[in-house]
Structure formats: C-alpha cells, structure tokens
C-alpha cells in the first residue's frame, strides 16, 4: 500500500535570465527511493539514481544543475521554460510517486513589480 505523500514548492515564478530551484520531498513512507526523475512535459531533464548518482539530459546540461539534495536547479531561464515540471520518485516496495510544480518565467520588470505585492 502506498502511504507516502510528496510535498512540492507548488506554483512558483522566477525572472527571465535568472535561476530557480525545483524541490520535492517524499514523506510518510519507509520505502527506499531508488531513483528520482525530473521531467518537463514528456521530456526527461535529469535523473538522480541511488546507485549511479546524477545524470543530466544532454539537451539541458548547460542550463540544469543537480541539487540541492534531490532537487533540481534551472538556470538562464527563458519564457519558454514556463510550464509544468514533475518529480517522479521511484521507490521500493511502494512504486512510483509523482509531484507537480508549475513554473512561470516572467519578464524582469513584471517579476520585480509582482514582488512588491507579495505578502511577507
């Protein structure tokens, strides 16, 4: 029975040209995490395998950095990076857990303007 839950950073926004950390956390299960996949739409961005460590997609190796932890850092953001990102935890014996993050990449001035109205 799958008892675990995934907590994510939820909906986030970042500035064009900047960087952002995508984070997920699996809790409420004793299952062993064997691999974490980071995906955007149907594209595999990166893998963190328990035995083999991090592997980054050849298409994204200049803009994606592993970590911190099992998270993923996206760099040199463009408006095209806006969209859904998924962390997929492969575990034993539970199976697969999936978390969703929505990233909106904003033009610099919009991101700055929006920041003024954030509730502390």
């Amino acid at each position: 029975m799958m008892t675990g839950t995934i907590e994510t950073t939820g909906n986030i926004s970042a500035e064009k040209g900047g960087s952002i950390i995508l984070q997920c956390h699996l809790s409420s299960t004793t299952a062993q995490v064997t691999q974490v996949n980071w995906e955007q739409q149907d594209q595999l961005l990166a893998i963190c395998n328990a035995d083999l460590g991090w592997h980054i997609s050849p298409s994204f190796k200049d803009r994606v950095a592993p970590g911190p932890g099992l998270g993923l850092t996206l760099q040199s953001l463009t408006v095209n990076d806006t969209g859904e990102y998924f962390c997929i935890y492969h575990t034993y014996p539970d199976g697969t857990y999936t978390g969703r993050i929505f990233l909106e990449v904003l033009e610099s001035s919009v991101a700055e303007h929006g920041a003024r109205f954030q509730i502390p």
Epitope: T34, Q35, N37, D42, Q43, L44, I47, N49, D51, L52, H55, S57, P58, H90, Y92, P93, G95, T96
Partner: antibody, heavy 120, light 110 residues
Framework: EVQLLESGGDLVQSGGSLRLSCAAS????????MTWVRQAPGKGLEWVST???????YYADSVKGRFTISRDNSKNMVYLQMNGLRAEDTAVYYC??????????????WGQGTTVTVSS | QSVLTQPPSASGTPGQRVIISCSGT????????VNWYQQLPGTAPKLLIY???QRPSGVPDRFSGSASGTSASLAISGVQSEDEADYYC???????????FGGGTKLTVL
C-alpha cells in the same frame, strides 16, 4: 507515442554473425535502460541482455562472450551484435524499454520483434 | 527451466475469476518488483501489471496483481474470451544480474 522498431534478423549459418538494431522514438532515450528478450519457436520469453542509460551491460549466461549489446544515445539506437551463433539462438528477438535509467524496474514497452534463424 | 515458476495452463469460463501464480526467490520477487505480461497469439508481449500491482493506462481493471514474500499472483476477475493468451511474470534478479521470466501460463477461456 513510444515506439521500438527492430531490424537485422535473418537466416544465418551456425557459427555466423548478425547485428540486430532497434530504433527508438517517442521518449527521452538517454534516460532509460534497454533490453533484448528472445522467444524460441513455441517457447517462453528468455532475457538476453540489458544496457543501462550509462552503458553498463548485463548478459544472460547463455550468450555471455558471444553477444554484445551497445547503444548510441545520439541516434536513439540500441544494437545486439551476435557472434558464434548456434541453432539454439533461433528465436524472435524483441527490443524492450525499461521504466528506469538503470535496471530492476519494469520492462514497459516492447517492439514487434525480428526473427533470427540459425541453420546447422 | 525457468527461474520463476508458473503453472503451464489455466482455464475459466466467461465471467469467472482466474488466478495465475508465480513463485520465485529472495533475489528476484523477494527483493524487486514483479511485472506481468500478456502475449496474444502471434504478437509481442504487452505490459499488463507493473510494480507488483499497478496497471498501465488502457489495461482493464479486471486485471490485478499482488506480491508477498517470494510469490506473486495475477488475478483476472470476470475473464473474457479476448483474455485468451499466454501470461508471463518477470522480475529483476539481483543475484543473476538479469531479468528472469516465468515459463508462461496459457489461459484458455472455455
């Protein structure tokens, strides 16, 4: 849509060689282990070889030293070089995709197979 | 001889519940996920159950899987004539460093 298309099967003399190819499409090929499974006429499925995303290789004892699995991530191709073929290698050879970068997960997609016939 | 043990045949009448067993060892079923494949006559195998009990999209919910210890089973509740096929269990074997399959079970719908 994930697709695997095998080719290279043929009729060959005992002791001969063949190279099977598998063209993959519809997924981020670099991030998944690939496997060859065979099925002799009227028999069950038999694992032949697996290659992880980082090119770690695994072989069944029955083919070790005779068969070589390889992959070209830039071309989305996996190959099986078969040398020293024997009559008992006669089978339909299936190319299959794993759900993980490494191994021990689930073979989730199969090609339609290519037929190898070894005559003695 | 297959590493995983399955009955060679199983049968049922339409609407009946059919269970196919698969027995292994600690190094395969006991420590890794079990998969079930359906192979219709003249076609390639198709994933039916993965990670012991998960169904891929498109697989009818009459198919279910379970695993405990070193054994697994596939249940077909309300078997139908189109379910007539060969069924294989499989798991990664950590000692052999390879996939192991059951010998297959031929399901006949009477």
């Amino acid at each position: 849509e994930v697709q695997l298309l095998e080719s290279g099967g043929d009729l060959v003399q005992s002791g001969g060689s063949l190279r099977l190819s598998c063209a993959a499409s519809g997924f981020s090929f670099w991030g998944y282990a690939m496997t060859w499974v065979r099925q002799a006429p009227g028999k069950g499925l038999e694992w032949v070889s697996t290659i992880a995303g980082n090119s770690y290789t695994y072989y069944a004892d029955s083919v070790k030293g005779r068969f070589t699995i390889s992959r070209d991530n830039s071309k989305n191709m996996v190959y099986l070089q078969m040398n020293g073929l024997r009559a008992e290698d006669t089978a339909v050879y299936y190319c299959a995709k794993d759900r993980s970068f490494y191994n021990y997960y689930d073979i989730d997609v199969w090609g339609q197979g290519t037929t190898v016939t070894v005559s003695s | 001889q297959s590493v995983l043990t399955q009955p060679p045949s199983a049968s049922g009448t339409p609407g009946q519940r059919v269970i196919i067993s698969c027995s292994g060892t600690n190094s395969n079923i006991g420590s890794n996920h079990v998969n079930w494949y359906q192979q219709l006559p003249g076609t390639a195998p198709k994933l039916l159950i993965y990670t012991n009990n998960q169904r891929p999209s498109g697989v009818p919910d009459r198919f279910s899987g379970s695993a405990s210890g070193t054994s697994a089973s596939l249940a077909i509740s309300g078997v139908q004539s189109e379910d007539e096929a060969d069924y294989y269990c499989a798991a990664w074997d950590g000692s052999l460093n390879g996939w192991v399959f059951g010998g297959g079970t031929k399901l006949t719908v009477l």
